[in-house]
């Protein structure tokens, strides 16, 4: 009785931002749920949390300093992470808990998504070349 989660094996975060879609083998319509994204092989860092229920708007927050937003589909939650640093390149795992109605359900651990954060390369702009030499 575990929800299955599908994630892309790898994503590259250009411009230090990425959309990570967590697809569930379960329809979240009419449920209260807590979807979360965890960083690291041991899932030690809870990057972002999305609370969903049918009476309020999605509640999205991070207690670990990540800039994140969330979007809900019938069988998916997409996490939008911004302002990522190169050293935050890691494996990220989606987690889902259906809190209501009973019975409580959660997911089998997914394979995770490696997010590779590419640093911004600050190149001199061709519009403003340096002083020309005679």
């Amino acid at each position: 009785n575990k929800i299955l989660v599908k994630q892309s094996p790898m994503l590259v975060a250009y411009d230090n931002a990425v959309n990570l879609s967590c697809k569930y083998s379960y329809n979240l319509f009419s449920r209260e749920f807590r979807a979360s994204l965890h960083k690291g092989l041991d899932s030690a860092v809870e990057v972002c949390v999305v609370y969903g229920n049918y009476s309020q708007q999605l509640q999205v927050y991070s207690k670990t300093g990540f800039n994140c937003d969330g979007k809900l589909g019938n069988e998916s939650v997409t996490f939008y992470l911004q302002n990522l640093y190169v050293n935050q390149t890691d494996i990220y795992f989606c987690k889902i808990e259906v809190m209501y109605p009973p019975p409580y359900l959660d997911n089998e651990k997914s394979n995770g998504t490696i997010i590779h954060v590419k640093g911004k390369h600050l190149c001199p702009s061709p519009l403003f070349p340096g002083p020309s030499k005679p």
Epitope: N1, N27, F29, N53, Y54, S55, M99, P103, L105
Partner: antibody, heavy 118, light 112 residues
């Protein structure tokens, strides 16, 4: 139109088991959990348990653990409840009821009368 | 288990009356999401219970606006503004927040 069609009345001997059904139509069966409720003669309603039809996961009222077993058949959009080791205390009307929004049972079956008598 | 106390047990009425039924729970029915799962049902003789009000105050589809629900925490009320013949029967409240879910003992609305 949402409908829950329950099987017919049952007359059983003490110690026997009975399995009753609740066929759902008019909605996506796996999107809503199904409750079962007991009403003994002249008494209030009593919640037996709930099943998630997608996975078949269940939660029971402690009072009915070991007495009631909830199952589903997704292919026929049917929920089942089996009662075992029947006694006269199990004589009652049993309802299936869909769990809608906000923890409410929004659609109910017509009820199944179970009589346990020797 | 959460005990749900419904009062009165019996309510003799005349058509056109306005009545209130009270439902009290032994603990708050607000969950961690801020939702309160309290609903009201009418059970007419020979029929199945029918949902009237869900989430304290939301009328279910097809339910006339003479039915209204209110309350919070542990105290809830169902009001019927103008009693009609089809309103006679047994009214139940249900708390769906804490397991096991529990019904009130019922209020019988009957003619004086």
């Amino acid at each position: 139109e949402v409908q829950l069609q329950q099987s017919g009345p049952e007359l059983e001997k003490p110690g026997a088991s009975v399995k009753m059904s609740c066929k759902a139509s008019g909605y996506s069966f796996t999107d809503y959990n199904m409750n079962w409720v007991k009403q003994s003669n002249g008494k209030s309603l009593e919640w037996i348990g709930i099943i998630d039809p997608y996975y078949g996961a269940t939660t029971y009222n402690q009072r009915f653990k070991g007495k009631a077993t909830l199952t589903v058949d997704k292919s026929s959009s049917t929920a089942y409840m089996q009662l075992k080791s029947l006694t006269s205390e199990d004589s009652a009307v049993y309802y299936c009821a869909r769990f809608g929004f906000y923890g409410a049972m929004d659609y109910w079956g017509q009820g199944i009368s179970v009589t346990v008598s020797s | 288990d959460v005990v749900v106390t419904q009062t009165p047990l019996s309510l003799p009425v005349s058509f056109g009356d306005q009545v209130s039924i009270s439902c009290r729970s032994s603990q708050s029915l607000a969950n961690s999401f801020g939702n309160t799962y309290l609903s009201w049902y009418l059970h007419k003789p020979g029929q199945s219970p029918q949902l009237l009000i869900y989430g304290i105050s939301n009328r279910f589809s097809g339910v006339p606006d003479r039915f209204s629900g209110s309350g919070s925490g542990t105290d809830f009320t169902l009001k019927i503004s103008t009693i009609k013949p089809e309103d006679l029967g047994v009214y139940y409240c249900l708390q769906g927040t804490h397991q096991p879910f529990t019904f009130g003992s019922g209020t019988t609305l009957e003619l004086k």
